[in-house]
Interface confidence: low
Amino acid sequence: KKVVLGKKGDTVELTCTASQKKSIQFHWKNSNQIKILGNQGSFLTKGPSKLNDRADSRRSLWDQGNFPLIIKNLKIEDSDTYICEVEDQKEEVQLLVFGLTANSDTHLLQGQSLTLTLESPPGSSPSVQCRSPRGKNIQGGKTLSVSQLELQDSGTWTCTVLQNQKKVEFKIDIVVLAFQKASSIVYKKEGEQVEFSFPLAFTVEKLTGSGELWWQAERASSSKSWITFDLKNKEVSVKRVTQDPKLQMGKKLPLHLTLPQALPQYAGSGNLTLALEAKTGKLHQEVNLVVMRATQLQKNLTCEVWGPTSPKLMLSLKLENKEAKVSKREKAVWVLNPEAGMWQCLLSDSGQVLLESNIKVLPTWSTPVQP
């Protein structure tokens, strides 16, 4: 018996061939011997089966001795043994129809679980192998689960159902809803304007939800909400903003926040959360702000940084075009009795300068100038 696998919703063509290459009488029946379709001369006739409105054949092939049964919009319950009667012979074809669906929605938040469920006819024992967009394979039975979805899991999942050494392939498009970056860090000199950007890693027709930025300043004992906002059809509107600092927010995507001035009391880390309409859970992006200040007080030149710096970052004070006078893995460095000239304070990581602040030291009778 020939086995043919079909996909729910698709069209399948079951073949039946006579030895005579001409149009002769044929009938297709199901396992209950109920007639599905056949011919009467050059006319197609249909029987009383449940497939009535979805069954068809190709009259153009009859003259070649081919009498296919075409079933449109396949359903799981169409799985059956179909019998073609032609020339006093019976050809049996077993049709097995499978369906593969994603749990509830194909748009899932980063960190959520994806469950793929296989619908299969009774008595079948298929195995399923799915390949994710990043090329990883999952194998399983009637359900396949992937926990902790990551950004790289966005895209087309290709799933192969194997039954009786035959295969049928499903493609499911999964969109992982996430920010492009899980975390970002901004380095600024004191007084500079700070731009925070939160680009999304997906595009959808309509995007509605609400968000909030919580900020934990390094100097503060607790975190506080800096801004709350609404998102309606990709338009951003601010609901509430603190007076200090007074953040400004862009009206369009990507989400964009401006802090008028980088000050030591603002240095720290924030967590922007975005709750999307009709989704459980939230999107998160961490943002960090490091602020640098260089000052000269009497005979002491000091450079300080505030905010979440890694222990391997180096803070240096050097006179322009000279070797560093002081260089430490600390958050403050200083030079006593600095000689006159343009001094540079550098925050660097493995030789790469992340932040630089210049301060001009004048001869001792003058006051310092910050360019």
Partner: antibody, heavy 120, light 107 residues
């Protein structure tokens, strides 16, 4: 609570075929892969292969030529046959359930193991 | 086949100590690594799946980390009942392979 129990083959003579059966109780054999793993005394774990409820198999290439696995869903059992055994096949043989899904993957239920000695 | 190299092969530590075992894969296996505990005369027991996820019912003193080729298994405060052999296992590709194991004993 799913439990696995390996059969006891006792002593097997060199060049003969080792046959083991694992009985699954407290749950269905369907919708999972089922693995065989062995461990020579004082040594590490070696994966022999696995079988799915539908009968599809994956074998370790190092043993493929000698291994046959089968499944009997009506009895909730799966079996291992290892042909042309030598003293090097002496080990504790375990059956285990492979939890599906690649993030969730893990051999999360194991039999208690059965000692197989190959000796004339 | 992907080779898994565990180190050390054996170690001795005192109750309350922090114990670390490493596992190195011969090629990139992303996060597709599990850790098992095997007590003498018993079958292995799954502790950590997908490099860092604690299996249900496993004490929180056990943890795992790593990605790519280098992985670490840690017991934050060694208890007498932790005396066992520990194995890493990759499932990035077939055949599934295990590390050679680390035997842990109490000083």
């Amino acid at each position: 609570q799913v439990q696995l129990q390996e059969s006891d083959p006792g002593l097997v003579k060199p060049s003969e075929t080792l046959s083991l059966t694992c009985t699954v109780s407290g749950g269905s054999i369907s919708s999972y892969y089922w693995s065989w793993i062995r461990q020579p005394a004082g040594k590490g774990l070696e994966w022999i292969g696995r079988i799915y409820a539908s009968g599809s198999t994956n074998y370790n290439p190092s043993l493929k030529s000698r291994v046959t696995m089968s499944v009997d869903t009506s009895k909730n059992q799966f079996s291992l046959k290892l042909s042309s055994v030598t003293a090097a096949d002496t080990a504790v043989y375990y059956c285990a359930r492979d939890r599906e899904g690649y993030y969730y993957y893990g051999m999360d239920v194991w039999g208690q193991g059965t000692t197989v000695t190959v000796s004339s | 086949d992907i080779q898994m190299t565990q180190s050390p092969s054996s170690l001795s530590a005192s109750v309350g100590d922090r114990v670390t075992i490493t596992c190195q894969a011969s090629q990139d296996i992303s996060k597709y690594l599990n850790w098992y505990q095997q007590k003498p005369g018993k079958a292995p027991n799954l502790l950590i799946y997908a490099a860092s996820n604690l299996e249900t019912g496993v004490p929180s003193r056990f943890s795992g980390s790593g990605s790519g080729t280098d992985f670490t298994f840690t017991i934050s405060s060694l208890q007498p009942e932790d005396i066992a052999a520990y194995y890493c296992q990759q499932y990035d590709s077939l055949p599934i392979t295990f590390g050679q194991g680390t035997r842990l004993e109490i000083k």
